[in-house]
Interface confidence: low
């Protein structure tokens, strides 16, 4: 007869006995692990689809020690997932204007390598300007041409137009560079081109390493303007001095992609739009675009958080002479987190961090055993996830409880019904030199062949001190062991079921009385260890009144210490 409960205990090899502890697959776009939510911060507004900032989850980055929880080199070495900006339906609060479409520029600007995160490029007075202040890797959705040594950018389209491509990850062998794709705009760019490569239709590859200052003016034809951002942070500024045909307004797109495992946070630094202009923000990278905000909600100081690693901002302006409004947004990547793990019923969970690398450790109340992994780790992914299923605390069918000081044993399924055809054995063992008191919290057995036996000893042959077959009423004063063991047997037959049993135990020293217990009440004691001579006074919680037994009891009889009266019970008024 094996009395050991089938659980992982200390001293046993972890990762071997655990059940249901297998890795779960990272959530996929087709089968998201849970609903995607996003969050905004001040000013506090009741916004459609907006949740208040969850301080515990999202402010952890401010706490000491959190840096160590970030994945090493969070923006290297893998490139962000390819953009697929076309089509992007269902923008929030859209009128009849066309939805996002894939930009098809006549020409792309030269990639540049910024000098620092702070924005190294200075506007040039002679040309219209878009300020880009982020250190960015190339977004894979645009093929980027590179000038050969000594070449000057043409003011007319080259014979081969550079159009959006979806050919997989960009060339991450080069440093991060900005991609600027514009149509109907002149853009001045100053910076360093470093080891950039581009391949054309004829498989010719050009590589240059040179420093240039250039002004690129593209053909003035109606159409969208579009920019890709792929660094950990950057600024999004409204296009300024963009010359357009008189009958066409601007339709500009800003695509942001950060490293998987991070979300995009966009802060409104300044915004001043003209009537009729729109700015819309969506989260991308999930199964569907996620509307985040539109101009109605984009107030100065507002923070929009996309829970995905890609976001898109669309700006639609009025045609001249009204001219476009202006805005200045700042975006940055923020570390996404695992969801807070469910606290198991009849147990507890301790979380060190919800960010990747953080852990959750689970414990069960006495009488329950953990099924599953005791320790989960938050893994980095596009949507971070726990490396195992959340465990549950189950009432075990038997087990050995050594060093039993105080606690309880419950039947499997408690407080729900037990199963049929059970045979459960529990062995309770008090610390050396102590005895046990067993208190009946609840016993509810089906009126057939289900049976509870409690034996005064450590095995199935020990003499019974309680047998549900023999006794109609529970001994309200409980049971005392003569030695340090109780052996509890619960057996159920093939029919009928009930709640089963919950037994509370406590150990007490020789020469002492056991610790009293009263449900829905309290007691005060003249001494903490209950030697002979101790008096205990009981009281009930509000709404309950004392019944049966005595309000004050005393530990008597030095030879066989025991309470002189039964513990009272507190009943609801």
């Amino acid at each position: 007869l094996s009395l050991e409960a089938p659980t992982v205990g200390k001293g046993q090899a972890p990762g071997i006995e655990e059940t249901d502890g297998e890795l779960t697959a990272a959530p996929t776009p087709e089968q998201p692990e849970r609903g995607v939510h996003f969050v905004t911060t001040a000013p506090t507004l009741k916004l459609l689809n907006h949740h208040p900032l969850l301080e515990e989850f999202l402010q952890e980055g401010l706490e000491k020690g959190d840096e160590e929880l970030r994945p090493a080199l969070p923006f290297q070495p893998d490139p962000p997932a390819p953009f697929t900006p076309s089509p992007l339906p269902r923008l929030a609060n859209q009128d009849s204007r066309p939805v996002f479409t894939s930009p098809t520029p006549a020409m792309a600007a030269v990639p540049t390598q910024p000098q620092s995160k702070e924005g190294p490029w200075s506007p040039e007075s002679e040309s219209p300007m878009l300020r880009i202040t982020a250190p960015l890797p190339p977004g894979p959705s645009m093929a980027v041409p590179t000038l050969g040594p000594g070449e000057i950018a043409s003011t007319t389209p080259p014979s081969r137009a550079w159009t959006p491509t979806q050919e997989g990850p960009g060339d991450m062998g080069r440093p991060w560079v900005a991609e600027v794709v514009s149509q109907g705009a002149g853009i001045g760019i100053q910076g360093t081109i470093t080891s950039s490569t581009a391949s054309g239709d004829d498989e010719e590859t050009t590589t240059t390493t040179t420093i240039i200052t250039t002004t690129i003016t593209t053909v003035q034809t109606p159409g969208p303007c579009s920019w890709n951002f792929s660094g950990p942070e950057g600024s999004l500024d409204s296009p300024t001095d963009l010359s357009s045909p008189t009958d066409v307004g601007l339709d500009c797109f800003f695509y942001i992609s950060v490293y998987p495992g991070y979300g995009v946070e966009i802060k409104v630094q300044n915004i001043s739009l003209r009537e009729g202009e729109t700015v819309t923000v969506e989260g991308l990278g999930g199964p569907d675009p996620l509307p985040l905000a539109n101009q109605s909600f984009l107030l100065r100081g507002q923070v929009i958080r996309s829970p995905t690693h890609q976001a898109a901002l669309r700006f639609q302006s009025l045609p001249p002479p009204a001219g476009p409004g202006t805005f200045h947004f700042h975006y940055q990547a923020y570390l996404l987190s695992c969801h807070f793990p469910r606290r198991p019923a009849y147990g507890d969970v301790t979380v060190t961090s919800l960010h990747p690398g953080g852990s959750a450790r689970f414990h069960c109340a006495t009488g329950y055993q953990l099924k599953g992994a005791r320790h989960l780790t938050c893994l980095n992914a596009t949507q971070p996830f726990w490396d195992s299923k959340e465990p549950v605390c189950i009432a075990a069918c038997g087990g050995v409880i050594r060093n039993a000081t105080t606690g309880r044993i419950v039947s499997p399924g408690f407080p729900g019904n037990y199963s049929n055809n059970l045979t459960c054995h529990w062995l309770l063992e008090a610390p050396e030199g102590q005895r046990l008191h067993l208190h009946f919290e609840k016993v509810s057995l089906a009126e057939d062949d289900d049976r509870l036996i409690i034996r005064n000893g450590d095995n199935v042959e020990a003499p019974p001190v309680y047998d549900s077959y023999e006794v109609e009423y529970l001994p309200i004063e409980g049971l005392l062991s003569s030695g340090k063991h109780f052996f509890v047997e619960l057996s159920t037959d093939s029919s009928g079921a009930a709640a089963g049993m919950a037994l509370r135990y406590e150990a007490f020293q020789q020469g002492h009385c056991y610790e009293p217990f009263v449900k829905y009440g309290n007691f005060s004691s003249s001494t903490p260890t209950y030697p002979v001579g101790t008096t205990v006074e009981f009281s009930c919680d509000p709404g309950y009144t004392l019944e049966q037994g005595s309000i004050i009891i005393e530990c008597v009889d030095p030879h066989d210490p025991q309470w002189n009266e039964t513990e009272p019970a507190c009943r609801a008024v």
Partner: antibody, heavy 114, light 106 residues
Framework: QVQLQQPGSVLVRPGDSVKLSCKAS????????MHWVKQSPGQGLEWIGE????????NYNEKFKGKATLTVDTSSSTAYVDLSSLTSEDSAVYYC???????WGQGTTLTVSS | ENVLTQSPAIMSASPGEKVTMTCSAS?????MYWYQQKSSTSPKLWIY???KLTSGVPGRFSGSGSGNSYSLTISNMEAEDVATYYC?????????FGSGTKLEIK
Amino acid sequence: QVQLQQPGSVLVRPGDSVKLSCKASGYTFTSYWMHWVKQSPGQGLEWIGEIHPHSGSTNYNEKFKGKATLTVDTSSSTAYVDLSSLTSEDSAVYYCVGGHYDYWGQGTTLTVSS
Amino acid sequence: ENVLTQSPAIMSASPGEKVTMTCSASSSVNYMYWYQQKSSTSPKLWIYDTSKLTSGVPGRFSGSGSGNSYSLTISNMEAEDVATYYCFQGSGYPLTFGSGTKLEIK
């Protein structure tokens, strides 16, 4: 059964660096944090930091940042601590601790002496 | 940093005597761990989750406490219990150990 094997002792000169190893067996190496603990002669125990082999995530005791670097090689189920710019203050026994704080290596005695 | 203060630093007990050592945490912890270390050997996890004994630990040992205050008790001291006992918390970073209680036999 669970075993964490560490070299018995290492002697290095001041200013040098050293990489101590800890080879794990008998449990799922990638499922549990691996901790490193320092015990100076006649002193108590100090937690250096932890690394999770599956994700490579690390947490360090502020006191050991810049001194210790934790790495793992999952293919060989081995954890490492790299100690740099060694001084006599770094002479100690270094333990690796696996599982849920359960399993300790026998410790590596590091002596820094010229 | 959560500082764990153990007391007493050194204590001696006679065989059969009851021994109690305490560990006080500067910040509340969820669970306390206790290690036993004998001279020239690695520490061994002795008690985990405040009161659970590691497999093979004699029943005369017990652990209790909550919040900021925890204790390890030996109901009747035996010669083999001579060792240094360290408390340890894993509830917050950095993880910390107590300075240890050295238990000797009279």
